[in-house]
């Protein structure tokens, strides 16, 4: 019977008593950075081509014994997951190994440095399909090993790496750390995060999405037919890999950006038990299991979204933080949140010639996260448009004026330490969805883009006092390119988006009284490619 | 995901405006930077990689390893080079005294200096 | 081209061994395991076993277990196949066959055993 | 470990279709079924491989696309269209069965194909 893991990431309508998805990433090739392998496992023979590549470190201790069938272990089984004959997830993936990790699982940044290298001169020399590199390693935060991988991503490589088994924040390792990495972490068959002896999965921010990690049977390298039972986030890292191979195979052309977006787009959502987090990073953790999406043909006429939040600014009071889309991405919103609730908005500005989100921290907070929402959006062409504070009382406003513009993100931002102790504004009037609202004493930033049939809307949810959070989600066929809250009140603690839902967070102010005045509104804007979702219906 | 102020140790070494004569001084105001791994079991001293500026050329790379090379004998230390990175990013490896750092640091094209560190399976 | 080259014909007396070869060309020998397999005067096929070209473990059919040893030269990228205690109806044409897969085959060679 | 089961054998015209069958035992419906050429002293040849799905990976060196496969509960199916003289073969399937030390490859007891 099909095993669990296969079973977790195949689509419904794949499902049979096989795993059988159609293609099986054939004119893609994967690059493992590991141990040896034993490369005439039945599982993966003739399908894995071991370069001549090895750089590793002396294995420790006057007694170490190089059992061969120990020095294979790691790179044999995820060789086999992801393209083994009976149990990987792109079986017709070509591989290449490279070794990095000695018989002890031990490699160093430079040999891995130089693997990556490489590997882009054998792209140089003999340009091919599209490459997958896995690095199912993870080592201390790392400049040097980040700005590799950025390179190499730049070139056209889609990277992917273990999020690290050491229960911690991803963002401390490497190359989990790195933005152009697609990082993942470990989940068991009950969707719970992958606890490993004391420690476990990473999390955080720096994760892009989880996958099947825990009792994975793949080629053991103790015999050409056996199979064995692995857990870690390298396992976790192989699916995913595999997964890519498939989807790059079915659209070879496919960006790392957008592959990233189809990746979280057709994740199970919201499955993940988040109580294994630490509290504090539950927010920054993606509750997103990857699974091949339901066809081989791309979405491509959806508009696909992602939330990316920035690190934390730090508790200084002109501390702030940046979060930033990738380069084939748009930033179509800013929103930002503080658990203490002190915070001075955000607002979107160009950094580089790029648009950037930024959040401000205030006086006595604890600082401030900036959450960016990334968008593919083929052709478009985006401004920022920035009303200063009005000080009337109506509030301060900011609406898409040029022509053919639609308003896909609302930011505010303010000087003022506490706009709590002022009067808030009135909700925006009904019917003039190309306009921004907020605080008067608060200046209004809004997103205003052109691009070919986008079409938006705003949505609210508004509740007569504040009850730990709000939410409102778009429906289906649209996608959530702005959260924000009306209104800026200090009850708010900020807004951002998870997947399809704008959730705004306050303090639950029941116990202290309230009143009607300190109504909170989620604000969504949802947003869809009109032509493209034409042409697909007509297509179907 | 992490952008450039990781949680990792940073040593900022000022450059001075000369170091023996060189000809090719670093461009003015610039600071190499160093960096360590924060998890200390991890960190391999001895053994460094150079990151140059993005745009050296593999010739610049070569011939600002060898100056190391040639500036470390002149303090009576022994230094390996065991890699010219090019392709992905401009640089070497070496295998040096810590001692050295501050002297290297000061290096035309340099960027930044990272110790080698472990990396493991996961 | 991939291809297996086998030794030549053998004739055995009963009790007595043979050893048949299988040179490789065409790919890396390392990355696929060699299949041996017979086949008797107009019978079918019938698997003998298998050898990792990578590190040598094996894996032999119940019925010969005991009697064959295979094993290879990576150096010349050639297996063999050792039969010992050679019975009548060991007489076969031994194949070699390219790792599990089994896509490239060897010409054959005929092992008659006799008194 | 699964029996293969095949006729002993098929004839087909000159130019004509035929379908040679290979029958897994009961409870190995979902075993990929390898399908092998062998013409008269000659060795055997790959031709392709076989599961529920149809085929998997791909043809064997030079077989041509008049061979095609399909897989149906416990039956394996080769198909020859347009048949010429060259593929008067004895046709063999084989199986995979097991892992470690209980690992066996088996074999069918082959079809003779005469072409008319």
């Known amino acids: 019977s099909i095993p669990w893991n296969l079973e977790r990431i195949t689509p419904p309508r794949y499902r049979a008593d096989e795993y059988q998805p159609p293609d099986g990433g054939s004119l893609v090739e994967v690059y493992l950075l590991d141990t040896s392998i034993q490369s005439d496992h039945r599982e993966i023979e003739g399908r894995v081509m071991v370069t001549d590549f090895e750089n590793v470190p002396e294995e420790d201790g006057t007694r170490f014994h190089r059992q061969a069938s120990k020095c294979d272990s790691h790179g044999t089984h995820l060789a086999g997951v992801v393209s083994g004959r009976d149990a990987g997830v792109a079986k017709g993936a070509s591989m290449r190994s490279l070794r990095v990790l000695n018989c002890q699982g031990k490699g160093t940044v430079s040999g891995t440095l130089i693997g990556l290298e490489f590997i882009r001169k054998s792209q140089l020399v003999q340009p091919v399909g599209p490459l997958v590199v896995l690095l199912p390693l993870a080592g201390g935060y790392s400049r040097v090993l980040n700005a590799a991988c950025q390179r190499l991503a730049r070139a056209g490589v889609v990277l992917v790496t273990a999020a690290g088994n050491f229960r911690d924040d991803a963002c401390l390792y490497s190359p989990a750390s790195a933005p152009e990495v697609i990082t993942v972490g470990a989940t068991n068959a009950q969707d719970q995060p992958v606890t490993l002896g004391t420690l476990g999965t990473n999390f955080g921010r720096c994760v892009d999405l989880f996958a099947p990690g825990e009792d994975i049977i793949g080629a053991s390298s103790d015999c050409s037919t056996c199979f064995v039972s692995q857990s870690g986030t390298s396992q976790a890292a192989a699916h995913v890999a595999g997964i890519a191979a498939m989807m790059l195979s079915a659209e070879p052309e496919l960006t790392l950006a957008e592959l990233r977006q189809r990746l979280i787009h057709f994740s199970a959502k919201d499955v993940i038990n988040e109580a294994w987090f630490p509290e504090d990073q539950r927010v920054l953790t993606p509750n997103l299991v990857a699974a091949l999406p339901p066809s081989t043909h791309g979405a491509g006429w959806q508009l696909f979204c992602r939330t990316v939040w920035s690190a934390h600014s730090g508790p200084t009071r002109m501390a702030t933080a940046i979060a930033r889309c990738a380069p084939d991405e748009e930033l179509l919103s800013c929103s930002s949140f503080s658990r203490s609730g002190k915070r001075r908005g955000e607002r979107m500005e160009a950094q580089g010639g790029k648009l950037v989100c930024r959040a401000h921290n205030a006086f006595g907070g604890e600082g401030v996260y900036a959450i960016a929402r990334c968008c593919l959006l083929p052709q478009a062409n985006c401004s920022v448009h920035t009303a200063p504070p009005a000080e009337a009382s109506m509030g301060t406003r900011v609406h898409c004026h040029q022509q053919g513009h639609v308003l896909t993100g609302c930011s505010s931002h303010w000087e003022v330490e506490d706009l709590g102790t002022h009067k808030p504004p009135v909700l925006r009037p009904r019917g003039q969805p190309n306009q921004c609202v907020g605080h008067r004493e608060a200046s209004i930033h809004a997103s205003c883009c052109h691009a070919p049939g986008l079409e938006c809307k705003v949505k609210e949810h508004g509740i007569p006092a504040p009850q730990g959070q709000v939410t409102v989600a778009c429906e289906e066929g649209w996608t959530l390119t702005g959260c924000s809250a009306l209104p800026g009140t200090s009850h708010v603690l900020g807004a951002y988006a998870v997947d399809n839902t704008c959730v705004v967070r306050s303090r639950d102010v029941s116990t202290t009284g309230s009143t009607s005045e300190e109504a909170v509104t989620a604000v969504a804007i949802c947003c869809r490619s009109r032509h493209l979702a034409q042409a697909s219906q007509e297509l179907q | 995901q992490e952008d450039e102020d990781g949680d990792y140790e940073e040593l900022v070494l000022a450059l001075r405006s000369e170091e023996d004569g060189l000809a090719e001084a670093p461009e003015h105001g610039t600071t190499a930077t160093f960096h360590r791994c924060a998890k200390d079991p991890w960190r391999l001293p001895g053994t460094y990689v150079v990151v140059l500026k993005e745009e050296t050329h593999l010739s610049q790379s070569e011939r600002t390893a060898r100056r190391l090379q040639a500036q470390a004998a002149r303090r009576g230390y022994l230094t390996k080079i065991l890699h010219v990175f090019h392709g992905l990013l401009p640089g070497f490896l070496v295998k040096m005294s810590g001692d050295l750092l501050e002297l290297a640091l000061k290096l035309p094209h340099v960027d930044y200096i990272e110790e080698d560190s472990s990396v493991f399976a996961q | 081209q991939v291809q297996l080259v086998q030794s030549g014909a053998e004739v055995k007396k009963p009790g007595a061994s043979v050893k048949v070869s299988c040179k490789a060309s065409g790919y890396t020998f390392t990355s696929y395991g060699i299949s041996w397999v017979r086949q008797a005067p107009g019978q079918g096929l019938e698997w003998m076993g298998w050898?990792?070209?990578?590190?040598?473990?094996?894996n032999y059919a119940q019925k010969v277990q005991g009697r064959v040893t295979m094993t290879t030269d990576t150096s010349t990228s050639t297996a063999y196949m050792e039969l010992r205690s050679l019975r009548s109806d060991d007489t076969a044409v031994y194949y070699c066959?390219?790792?599990?897969?089994?896509?490239?085959w060897g010409q054959g060679t005929l092992v008659t055993v006799s008194s | 470990q699964p029996v293969l089961t095949q006729p002993l054998f098929a004839s087909a015209s000159l130019g004509a279709s035929v379908t040679l069958t290979c029958t897994l035992s009961s409870g190995y419906s979902s075993y990929e079924v390898d399908w092998y050429q062998q013409r008269p002293g000659k060795g055997p040849r790959f031709v392709m491989r076989v599961d529920t799905g149809g085929i998997v990976g791909s043809k064997g060196e030079g077989i041509p696309d008049r061979f095609s496969v399909l897989g149906s509960g416990l039956n394996r199916y080769l198909t020859i269209k347009n048949i010429q003289e060259e593929d008067e073969s004895d046709y063999h399937c084989?199986?995979?069965?097991?892992?470690?030390?209980?690992?066996?490859?088996?074999f069918g007891g082959g079809t003779k194909l005469t072409v008319l």
């Open positions: 066959a390219r790792g599990y897969t089994r896509d490239y």
């Open positions: 084989g199986a995979d069965h097991g892992s470690g030390t209980n690992f066996v490859v088996v």
């Open positions: 050898i990792s070209t990578y590190n040598g473990n094996t």
